[in-house]
Each structure stands twice: as structure tokens, then as C-alpha cells.
Amino acid sequence: QAEESPFVGNPGNITGARGLTGTLRCQLQVQGEPPEVHWLRDGQILELADSTQTQVPLGEDEQDDWIVVSQLRITSLQLSDTGQYQCLVFLGHQTFVSQPGYVGLEGLPYFLEEPEDRTVAANTPFNLSCQAQGPPEPVDLLWLQDAVPLATAPGHGPQRSLHVPGLNKTSSFSCEAHNAKGVTTSRTATITVLPQQPRNLHLVSRQPTELEVAWTPGLSGIYPLTHCTLQAVLSDDGMGIQAGEPDPPEEPLTSQASVPPHQLRLGSLHPHTPYHIRVACTSSQGPSSWTHWLPVETPEGVPLGPPENISATRNGSQAFVHWQEPRAPLQGTLLGYRLAYQGQDTPEVLMDIGLRQEVTLELQGDGSVSNLTVCVAAYTAAGDGPWSLPVPLEAWRPGQAQPVHQLVKEPSTPAFSWPHHHHHHHHHH
């Protein structure tokens, strides 16, 4: 049978609350050189134990008996420190362990999770979490809203998760953890009620440099909306912004709207340009979330100025006219030019030149018509821009270059009949 155990003192028991400091002690009496004392917790050697070993000889000879005392210090007791503790020594070819001592944790509940501050949209459901542990178990939770208990007694209402169906005012929540030792109260979480995201952002009207937009406000609880903020950003040919992308790729145009009405005119925009817009509304508690980006586009406008540098020269029965693109903004895609010419006593002739910037006219009457003038206007899909001032046809002088151009015969009657909105009458003849 095994030799008698050398242990003459075994570890005691420690039970206390978190943070407690305590010491376990074991004592043995051995003959000869004292062994190193190891500590086990639940059968596992403690490699980084805060232990001290004291050795006292009972005689003058090294081979006499020794008293060995090992002390294990537990600082700031935690759940991971709990378990069964034993001392272990290797003596010769034998292994000895002490009787076990136990370290337990017992005190007020300890929070593993507490409710956190957060923002929620008005009348929108959300959850809060709270988790506590002993020992001793069980730990029962009691939720409080604005310091008012939400159940008749601990453990009777919601426990780890509190489901709140919605709030219409900013509120505070906390939870109490109850066990046999008493009560611990969690931190107080503030739940801030923000306006709901606006809905149905849409265009009311469009102008080349102006968009009128409207939206439906979301609920904001007991807090009236103070204003709404609209952002517009150039769509950059569809690059960069997707429907749900949180931040625009460049600095947006930001406008504030007093509310009501939930409508805003956005000015100073580029014509015929794609934009993305979004809106958020603000109460005294803060702003709602932004709506998704809505793609919109300003329509085309008519050119803002006439063609430039018009020159018109006449050589017998032919007239050569050329010009340059308007310097003023086109407000869209240039589709072409219209030309009108008229003599002193002859009807006005209107022509669509297309995108060319020059034309040679074949005049009737062998050039006998006097005081001939020419006007040119640029047009887009939105209509004609302003006509140029009338330019008189000058006689061609030898030495002037006159390139060969397609001849355009002057019709005996006006060749074109323009739809009313395309024909800008001019008053200079």
C-alpha cells in the first residue's frame, strides 16, 4: 500500500464576492531535502501561481525533517478562480496530493451585459439586453423604464432581452439583478427617439436649372419636426452612388427646408444633368436617417445665346453664310441651327441647316433683291435659342476666299412650316 501522505495541513475553503483577496495554505513534513510544492486547480497544475514556499528545518542535519509551507495568494477573486485546490509534491518516486480546499464565489449579482445607450426611430420596435450571474444562482432580472418597474416582481417579466414595441419619447431603461445576496442595478441606458425616415421623396416639377421636390415626413413622437435637410449631388454618370450608399462621393449641395410644407425648390442646378437627392428630417432630439438616394435629372433647356461671329457675303446670285457655336450655355445637346433670311420687300425664308456651321444660298432674281439680311439661331430638343441680330449680306470682293459649298436653292415660297413652339419670331425685319 502507499506510503503515508506527508501533508499535515491542507488548504481551507474560501468563499467570497468578486474582488476578494484570500490565501490558501498547505503544510507538509518531509525527511531530507524539501520538495517544490505545486498547486492544482481542478487537477490542472497552476503554471503562473502567485505562491510562496517557506522551509523550516526541524534539526541541524540536512537529512532531518523539514516543515514546508506553501501559500497561494488569490488576488481579486474572479469566476475563473473557483474550483478545487490541492497541493502536489513529487517525493522520490512517489506523488502526493493534499486534501482539497474549495474556492467559491458568492456575492451580489455581477453584470455580464448591461443596456446600452442608443437612438431609435419613433414608434419602431427594438430590443435591449441585460445579463447577470451569481453565484449564488439563480439571478432574476427586473427591467425598469423611466425608473418604473416593467413587471410585478423580479423574474416575472422579460429577462435577458427586453422587447420594446416602440417609443414616442426619449426614455431611460435599466435592469436590476436579484439573487439571495441582494440587488445590483445596471447602468441607465438613454434611448433617444428620433424622427422616422421620410418617405416617398419625389419630384413635383422640373426646370432646366431647378427641381421642386416633396416628401412625406415620418412620425417623430412628441417632438415636432424643426426642419428637413435635402442633399443633392451630381450623379457622375452613375458612378459612385448606389441606392443605399451611405456617403456621397463628393461634397453635396445642402439645403434646409422649414416644415411644413414638406417641399423644397432646389435652384442653381445644371441643365440636362443627372443628380441624386436625399432628405432627412430633424426634431429637437436629432435627425432621422437619410432616405435612399433618388436619381433625378434636370431637363434640357434652349441655348441661352445666339450663334457667334456670323458673316454673310454675296456674290451674284449666291450668298455664303458661316458662324460659330454660341458662347452662352447650350443647356442641352445642340441639335442644329436655323437660318432665316429676308429682303426688303420679300417674305422671310426659314431653313434648318443641321449641325453645319456654314451654308451657300442660291438666291432668286439674279441677286436683284436689295437689303438682304440673315439671322441664325441654335436649337436643342427643348427648342430654339435666341436669334442673332440681322446680318446684312455684303458684296463679295475679289480676293476673298469662297469655299465650294453645297448650293441651296431658294424656294419660291417659304420652305418650312415650324410647329408653333419651335418658331421664335424675330422683330428685326
Epitope: G43, Q44, E47, P100
Partner: antibody, heavy 116, light 106 residues
Framework: QVQLVQSGAEVKKPGASVKVSCKAS????????INWVRQAPGQGLEWMGW????????KYNEKFKGRVTLTVDTSISTAYMELSRLRSDDTAVYYC?????????WGQGTLVTVSS | QIVLTQSPDFQSVTPKEKVTITCSAS?????MYWYQQKPDQSPKSLIY???NLASGVPSRFSGSGSGTDYTLTINSLEAEDAATYYC?????????FGQGTKLEIK
């Protein structure tokens, strides 16, 4: 001297349970942990859990939780390992081993074969 | 859990040679333990607390190491040392073993 003597080989059908015994001698049975370690054919060693005979406290490897039960009968210095819901991959040699922070003494092993 | 990786998996050695088996841990540990298992036998404790010889183990066996790298050394190998050697840690739960190193005598 320290000795751990295990029960004999077992053949079981899938879904059945097996209970292996380990009789200890040569040391104070209630002072030392008894561990169970298994070794599948041609494989390495896998710890299953321990029991402290002095208190009956147990600790299990998560892999086996719910299927393994460790017990002792201190009156006859015997530890038991029961494994339920056996599968073919539970075929292995099962060892009991005394521990003092490591496994200082081992039983001779019990072969458990699971086959339909 | 801590994974222990032994090297080599297999070694064929002649008697009187010096053999070194290494064991690498996936995270730092305080102590390493070594076991010897001969064919059709149960494992036997060889080294405990990294460098201490278990009862009855010949002095040609020794252990060393710290942190993540540990070594078992057999000086002047003998025929009876043909076996599979396992390293083991219990610095954290669960205790785990290396995959084993099989030593064959030429």
C-alpha cells in the same frame, strides 16, 4: 505500487451504450483525479474527461458532453466511463489514467468495437 | 484548444544514435509532458514538468524547452526504445496530445 485495471473488450451496435470500469489500487483512491483518454485504431490520444473520486465532481471535453458519463464507487475504488449513442467512429481503446497535473499511471486499456 | 505538432512523424534510427523529437504548441504553455507507447501497450509517463524524469525512466531520456517549443532527447538509443512518443500539455483545457512520433530501430 499504483495499478489501474480495466474491464475487458466490448462489441456494441451503433446507438447502444458501453460502460467500462477501472479498478484502482496502491494509492488513496479518493485523493487523485481519474481521467479517461481514448485512442482510435492507428490514431493519437484524445482526452475525454475527469472525475474526482473524493467529491464526484466531473469535467468533460466539450466534444463528448452529453454522451459521456463518469462515475465512481469509492467503496470498491472503481471508476466508470459510460458512452452512449455509440457510432462506428467510437471504435477505440479506452484508457483510464490517474492524474497529478499529468497522466502518471494508465490502465491497460479496453477495446470497444462498434459495428452493426 | 492548444494544438501540439510533433516533428518528425516517423524516424528510423540505429542503436547508440542520439534522437531529438520536437513539439511545437499553437500558443505559449508553461510545462510539457512526454509519454512512450510501445505496440499493444498503454502509454507510460516519461517526462513531467518539461524536464523531470518519471519514476523508472532511464537517464538517457531528457526534456527541455519553454514557450511554444519543446524537445525530447534520447541519448544513445537502445533497441527497447522503439515506440511511439507523444507530447502533451495541460496549460489550458482541454488537455491535448501531439499526433505522435514513431521511432523505429534499424
Amino acid at each position: 505500487q499504483v495499478q489501474l485495471v480495466q474491464s475487458g473488450a466490448e462489441v456494441k451496435k451503433p446507438g447502444a451504450s458501453v460502460k467500462v470500469s477501472c479498478k484502482a489500487s496502491g494509492y488513496p483512491f479518493t485523493d487523485f483525479y481519474i481521467n479517461w483518454v481514448r485512442q482510435a485504431p492507428g490514431q493519437g490520444l484524445e482526452w475525454m474527461g475527469w472525475i474526482y473520486p473524493g467529491s464526484g465532481n466531473t469535467k468533460y471535453n466539450e466534444k463528448f458532453k452529453g454522451r459521456v458519463t463518469l462515475t465512481v464507487d469509492t467503496s470498491i475504488s472503481t471508476a466508470y466511463m459510460e458512452l452512449s449513442r455509440l457510432r462506428s467512429d467510437d471504435t477505440a481503446v479506452y484508457y483510464c489514467a490517474r492524474s497529478t497535473g499529468f497522466f502518471d499511471y494508465w490502465g491497460q486499456g479496453t477495446l470497444v468495437t462498434v459495428s452493426s | 484548444q492548444i494544438v501540439l505538432t510533433q516533428s518528425p512523424d516517423f524516424q528510423s534510427v540505429t542503436p547508440k544514435e542520439k534522437v531529438t523529437i520536437t513539439c511545437s504548441a499553437s500558443s505559449s504553455i508553461g510545462y510539457m509532458y512526454w509519454y512512450q507507447q510501445k505496440p499493444d501497450q498503454s502509454p507510460k509517463s516519461l517526462i513531467y514538468l518539461t524536464s523531470n524524469l518519471a519514476s523508472g525512466v532511464p537517464s538517457r531520456f531528457s526534456g527541455s524547452g519553454s514557450g511554444t517549443d519543446y524537445t525530447l532527447t534520447i541519448n544513445s538509443l537502445e533497441a527497447e526504445d522503439a515506440a511511439t512518443y507523444y507530447c502533451q500539455q495541460w496549460s489550458s483545457n482541454p488537455p491535448t496530445f501531439g499526433q505522435g512520433t514513431k521511432l523505429e530501430i534499424k
